[in-house]
Interface confidence: low
C-alpha cells in the first residue's frame, strides 16, 4: 500500500450514486461529486457501513437496501408481468463511458434505454451501471442474495422518469423514485462473450478515477437470458446517502462470467483515506451488508411458466457462494528444510477447516530464478500420501519458491500457502511484512491513480537455517493491473531483494535503522487486526476473519497487444500505451519492532478461520500499540542506496525495479494450472540468529491491500 | 419442450451437409444447445455448443471440421467436408441452463451417411 | 486429451443392486454426469452433478463420487433398466470448454 501524506485539507468525496453528466464540457464525463455537502464514506473501517448513519442520516432507514431475498416469502404479484425493454437491444455508441470511482467501476449510459413494466410508475431511462464483487475466486459480491446465497457479481443498472426530470441526479437530489434492476453474475466455466466489452474497459480503469470509452456491446446481453422471473421491492440506494427512493427489479436468474473474466474486477484499484494518510488498495468486497425487511414484502413476477424451470437445482447450486471455489483453508505448517547439499523436502499439514471436503491432492508449486530465468514447476501429491515432496537437484545459485494448495473435488483448491523462499549460503536473516518506499508529494502531487501497487503485493518474510535461509511470503501477488503477470520468483528476486539491496547469492544483513521505528496512527485500525509476528516454528494455522486472498491464473490478464512495456520511469514503473494505465511499485511504509530476547514464550492460540466473511466481520483493534507518525520525505530519484548505519531512522529508500513480466498468454485450457499466492498469515520462521530484525505490519486486509495497522511485539522461542 | 433434428441423408464425401435441430417450448436465449453425434454400435461422442448468446465452443477433434450456428428456433450443425468417418447418427440437446456438462433434453437424431 | 474410462459391460441380476464407474485422472476435480440410452433412442439424463437427479428419474439411480471415480448406482435393478450408461464431463474452462462422454457400458440385467 503507498502511503503519502496530505499535506492540503483532507477532500470529502461524493458517493456512487453523484456520478452525473457534465453538459457544459467538450467531453461527456463521469464525474465524482467533491462538494462539502457529500462526505466521505468506505466499505470498512472508520468510515464503513457502520458509520454510514453519521454523516447520512437516510442510511439507518427501515427500508434499506439490499436484502436477502427468501422466495417462499415472495407473493406472486398479478401487476409485475413482463418487462417493456426499449432500446436495450441497440449496440452502445462509442461515446458510453466507464470509470473507476474508487467505490465501485460505473458505466454511464449515452444511448437512450427504457423500461416500463414490472409495476413501474412510468416509463424509465437508464443512466448508468454500477459493479460490486467480492475478493478472489468467485467469492460473494454481490449485495443482493436469494435465499441467502449471493454471487460473485452484481450489476445494477439505475433509472429514473425523464418526463419527471431533467437528469437522474435531479430526481436523486430531490428524493423522487428512482428504478433500479439487479442482476447477478454467476460463476461458468466459459467465457461469457457479451462481457468482451466490458472486461476490456475494465483493463482500461484499474486505478482510481481512471475514465475510458467502451466498445460497443448490447445491454440486453448483460442482462439474464431470460427476463420472466424477478422480484420486486421498495428499497434506497446501496451507497450514501441512502435514500429510500429505489422500485428494485431483482432478476432470478444469472448471467455467466468465467473466472477468468471475473479477474478483471479483482484488479481494480481504489484509494482510501484515513484522516490525512491516503493508500492505494485492491477495491475488493465493495458490497454494502444486507439489511432488515422490516415491514416490507417482496413480489416476484407473475409471469407465467417463468419460475417453473429448476427452481430447486438454482436453490441448490454452490456455485458463487463464499467458499465456492476455496474449498478449505490453506495448507499449514509449511515447513522447506535441506536434505542435503543438493536436495530440500518441503512439507506442510492439511488445512485446518474443510468447506467442500474431500482433499483428493495437494500441488505443490516451486519457481526458481538462474541466470535471470524464471521457470516453474507444479505437480501432484495425493492426498492420503505423506505431506512432503523432495525437491532434488537444487542449484545454490538460485533463489526457490515454494507453495502448496489443496485440491478438493470439480476443480475446487484451497487457497495458496505460505509461499516459502529457499537461497542457498545465506546466513542472516530477518522477517517483516513490507518492502518499503515512503513518499510524499511536491507541490504537485502525483494523481492516485498513478501509484498503485505492482503484482507482488505484500510480503511477510521469515527465514531460518545456515547454510540455508528461508523466507515466506505471506501475502504473495494479486493480478497485475497491467495485464501481464510476473512469477514469484521474479518480483521477488528482481524487485525485492533487490530493492533492499541484497546482493550475489546471500541476502545481506540488514540494519534496523534502515526502518522507520513508528507507523502512522490510522483510524483504519479498527479495519484489521493487528497480529504479532511470531517466530515459531510453524505458521499461524489459519487466517483471522479479515484474512483476504487474490490468486490469479499465471499469465492471465494479458490481452493481444498489451505486453509492450514502455522504459521505466523514475518511479520504476511500467507504463502500457494499449490501456493507458499504469502499474507502479508498490510502496509501503513500515514500522520496526525487534525480536524479544526471551526464549519459549507462551504463543498465543492461532485465529480460527472464518469461511464466511463478511465487510462488517473481524474488525477489531489490539490496545496498547498506538504511535503517532508523520511519513518524511525522501530522496525520489529511485537511485540506488545501500542503507547503511549511518542513515537517518526516520528515512527509507528503496530502489525500484519492475518485476520482469512472463510471455505466457492466459489460455484457460489446463485448469491445474498454478494460480498466484494468496494472503495468508504470517509465518513463525524455524529459528532465527540473534541479530534477526522483525518488522511487523499487520498483512491481514479487508481489500487484500489495505492501510498499515499498528505494529505488534516480535517474538523469539 | 422438444427438439427435432432434421437433415441427415446420404452425401458423398467432402459434400457439404447441414443439420437443422428445431426447438418449440423454450427460447434459445435462455439456453445453451450442443450436438452430440453416435456412430453405428459405438458411444456418444460430443461435438461443440452454441451458448445462449451466440458463441461456440468445439472438441478438439470438431474444431474447423463442423460449425454451429442458430436462428431464433433453429440450431445448425455444418459439416464443412464430411467423411466417411462422419456417418453417425447426429443429436441436438440443450444443456441444463444452471448445470453445465448436462444435458436435460434430447432430440430422437438425425442420421448421415456419408458414402461414395 | 481427457478420457473417461468405463467398463465395456456388467450384468446384474434382477433386483440386485449395481454400481457402475466412471475414472479419469482428475476427474476429482470434476462434476459428472450420468445418461440412459436405450436401443434405438436418444440418451436421457439420469444424474447431474455427480449426485443430483432429475425430476421424473427414479430414486434407484444415485450417483456418487470418490477420487478419480464416478459412480451410477442402479438399486432394485429392473429388466427396463437394460440399456447403455454413459458418464460425463467438462474439461477446460473459459474459450476452451469442451464437453467429454466415456466409452459407455452395456448393461445387462438377467
Known amino acids: 500500500v503507498l502511503h503519502y501524506v496530505v499535506c492540503f485539507p483532507a477532500l470529502t468525496e461524493g458517493y456512487v450514486g453523484a456520478l452525473h453528466e457534465n453538459r457544459h464540457g467538450s467531453a461527456v464525463q463521469i464525474r465524482r461529486r467533491k462538494a462539502s455537502g457529500d462526505p466521505y464514506w468506505a466499505y470498512s473501517g472508520a468510515y464503513g457501513p457502520e458509520h454510514w448513519v453519521t454523516s447520512s442520516v437516510s442510511c439507518g432507514g427501515r427500508h434499506q437496501s439490499p436484502i436477502d431475498i427468501l422466495d417462499q416469502y415472495a407473493r406472486v404479484g398479478e401487476e409485475y408481468q413482463e418487462l417493456q425493454l426499449d432500446g436495450f437491444d441497440n449496440e452502445s455508441s462509442n461515446k458510453t463511458w466507464m470509470k473507476n470511482t474508487g467505490k465501485t467501476v460505473a458505466i454511464l449510459l449515452k444511448d437512450d434505454y427504457f423500461v416500463s413494466g414490472a409495476g413501474l410508475p412510468g416509463r424509465f431511462k437508464a443512466e448508468k451501471v454500477e459493479f460490486h464483487w467480492g475478493h478472489s475466486n468467485g467469492s460473494a459480491g454481490s449485495e443482493h442474495s436469494i435465499n441467502g446465497r449471493r454471487f460473485p457479481v452484481e450489476m445494477q443498472i439505475f433509472f429514473y422518469n425523464p418526463d419527471d426530470f431533467d437528469s437522474f441526479q435531479t430526481a436523486i437530489s430531490e428524493n423522487r423514485i428512482i428504478g433500479a434492476m439487479a442482476i447477478f453474475f454467476q460463476v461458468s466455466p466459459r467465457d461469457n462473450s457479451a462481457l468482451d466489452p466490458i472486461i476490456h474497459g475494465l483493463k482500461g480503469v484499474v486505478h482510481h478515477e481512471k475514465e475510458t470509452f467502451l466498445d460497443p456491446f448490447v445491454l440486453r446481453d448483460l442482462l439474464p437470458a431470460s427476463l420472466g422471473s424477478y422480484y420486486r421491492y421498495t428499497g434506497s440506494l446501496t451507497t450514501p446517502p441512502c435514500s429510500e427512493i429505489v422500485e428494485w427489479i431483482v432478476f432470478r436468474r444469472p448471467v455467466p462470467i468465467s473466472y477468468h473474466q471475473l479477474e478483471a474486477f479483482y484488479s481494480i484499484f481504489t484509494t482510501e483515506q484515513q484522516d490525512h494518510v491516503k493508500s492505494v488498495e485492491y477495491l475488493r468486497n465493495n458490497f454494502r451488508p444486507q439489511q432488515r425487511l422490516h415491514d416490507r414484502v417482496v413480489s416476484k413476477s407473475a409471469v407465467r411458466d417463468s419460475w417453473n424451470h429448476d427452481m430447486t437445482d438454482f436453490l441448490e447450486n454452490p456455485l458463487g457462494t463464499e467458499a465456492s471455489k476455496v474449498c478449505s483453508s490453506p495448507p499449514i505448517h509449511m515447513k522447506v528444510q535441506p536434505l542435503n547439499q543438493t536436495a530440500l523436502q518441503v512439507s506442510w499439514s492439511q488445512p485446518e477447516t474443510i468447506y467442500h471436503p474431500p482433499i483428493m491432492n495437494y500441488m505443490i508449486s516451486y519457481s526458481w530464478t538462474k541466470n535471470e530465468d524464471e521457470k516453474e514447476k507444479t505437480f501432484t501429491k495425493d492426498s492420503d500420501k505423506d505431506l512432503k515432496a523432495t525437491i532434488s537437484h537444487v542449484s545454490p545459485d538460485s533463489l526457490y519458491l515454494f507453495r502448496v494448495q489443496a485440491v478438493c473435488r470439480n476443480d475446487m483448491r484451497s487457497d495458496f500457502s505460505q509461499t516459502m523462499l529457499f537461497q542457498a549460503n545465506t546466513t542472516r536473516i530477518f522477517q517483516g511484512t513490507r518492502i518499503v518506499k515512503t513518499g510524499v508529494p511536491t507541490a504537485s502531487p502525483a494523481s492516485s491513480a498513478d501509484m498503485a501497487p505492482i503484482s507482488s503485493g505484500s510480503s511477510t518474510w521469515t527465514s531460518s537455517g545456515i547454510p540455508f535461509s528461508f523466507v515466506s511470503m505471506a501475502t504473495g501477488m494479486g493480478p497485475s493491473s497491467s495485464g501481464s503477470q510476473a512469477t514469484v520468483a521474479s518480483v521477488v528476486t528482481s524487485t525485492l531483494l533487490a530493492g533492499l539491496g541484497f546482493g550475489g547469492g546471500g541476502i545481506s544483513s540488514f540494519p534496523s535503522t534502515v526502518w522507520p521505528t513508528r507507523l502512522p496512527t490510522a483510524a483504519s485500525a479498527s479495519k484489521q487486526a493487528a497480529r504479532p509476528v511470531l517466530a515459531t516454528t510453524e505458521a499461524l494455522a489459519s487466517p483471522g476473519p479479515d484474512g483476504d486472498s487474490s490468486p490469479t491464473k499465471d499469465g492471465e490478464g494479458t490481452e493481444e497487444g498489451e505486453k509492450d512495456e514502455k522504459s521505466e520511469s523514475e518511479d520504476g514503473e511500467r507504463e502500457h500505451e494499449e490501456d493507458g494505465e499504469k502499474d507502479s511499485e508498490k510502496k509501503e511504509k513500515s514500522g520496526v519492532t525487534h525480536a524479544a530476547e526471551e526464549r519459549n514464550q507462551t504463543e498465543p492460540s492461532p485465529t480460527p478461520s472464518s469461511p464466511n466473511r463478511t465487510a462488517e466481520g473481524g474488525h477489531q483493534t489490539i490496545p496498547g500499540h498506538e504511535q503517532d507518525h508523520t511519513a518524511v520525505p525522501t530522496d525520489q530519484t529511485g537511485g540506488r542506496r545501500d542503507a547503511g548505519p549511518g542513515l537517518d531512522p526516520d528515512m527509507v529508500t528503496s530502489t525500484q525495479v519492475p518485476p520482469t513480466a512472463t510471455e505466457e498468454q492466459y489460455a484457460g485450457s489446463d485448469p491445474k494450472r498454478p494460480e498466484m499466492p494468496s494472503k495468508k498469515p504470517m509465518s513463525r520462521g524455524d529459528r532465527f540468529s540473534e541479530d534477526s530484525r522483525f518488522i511487523t505490519v499487520n498483512p491481514a486486509e479487508k481489500n487484500t491491500s489495505g492501510m498499515i495497522s499498528r505494529p505488534a511485539p516480535g517474538r523469539m522461542e | 419442450q422438444s427438439l427435432e433434428e432434421s437433415g441427415g441423408r446420404l452425401v458423398t464425401p467432402g459434400t457439404p451437409l447441414t443439420l437443422t435441430c428445431t426447438v418449440s417450448g423454450f427460447s434459445l436465449s435462455s439456453y445453451a444447445m450442443g450436438w452430440v453425434r453416435q456412430a453405428p454400435g459405438k458411444g456418444l461422442e460430443w461435438i461443440g455448443i452454441i451458448d445462449s448468446r451466440g458463441s461456440t465452443y468445439y472438441a478438439t477433434w470438431a474444431k474447423g471440421r463442423f460449425t454451429i450456428s442458430k436462428t431464433s428456433t433453429t440450431v445448425d450443425l455444418k459439416i464443412t467436408s464430411p467423411t466417411t468417418e462422419d456417418t453417425a447418427t447426429y443429436f441436438c440437446?440443450?444443456?441444463?441452463?444452471?448445470?453445465?456438462?448436462?444435458?436435460?433434453?434430447w432430440g430422437p437424431g438425425t442420421l448421415v451417411t456419408v458414402s461414395s | 486429451s481427457f478420457v473417461l474410462t468405463q467398463p465395456a459391460s456388467v450384468q446384474v441380476n434382477l433386483g440386485q443392486t449395481v454400481s457402475l464407474t466412471c475414472t479419469a485422472d482428475t476427474l476429482s476435480r470434476r462434476y459428472a454426469s450420468w445418461y440412459q440410452q436405450k436401443p434405438g433412442q436418444a440418451p436421457v439424463l439420469l444424474i447431474y452433478?455427480?449426485?443430483s437427479r432429475p425430476s421424473g428419474v427414479p430414486d434407484r439411480f444415485s450417483g456418487s463420487s470418490s477420487g478419480n471415480t464416478a459412480t451410477l448406482t442402479i438399486s432394485g435393478a429392473q429388466a427396463g433398466d437394460e440399456a447403455d450408461y454413459y458418464c460425463a464431463t467438462s474439461d477446460g474452462s473459459g474459450s476452451s470448454y469442451q464437453c467429454v462422454f466415456g466409452g459407455g457400458t452395456q448393461l445387462t440385467v438377467t
Open positions: 452433478r455427480d449426485t
Open positions: 440437446a440443450r444443456e441444463d441452463s444452471y448445470y453445465y456438462d448436462s444435458f436435460n433434453l
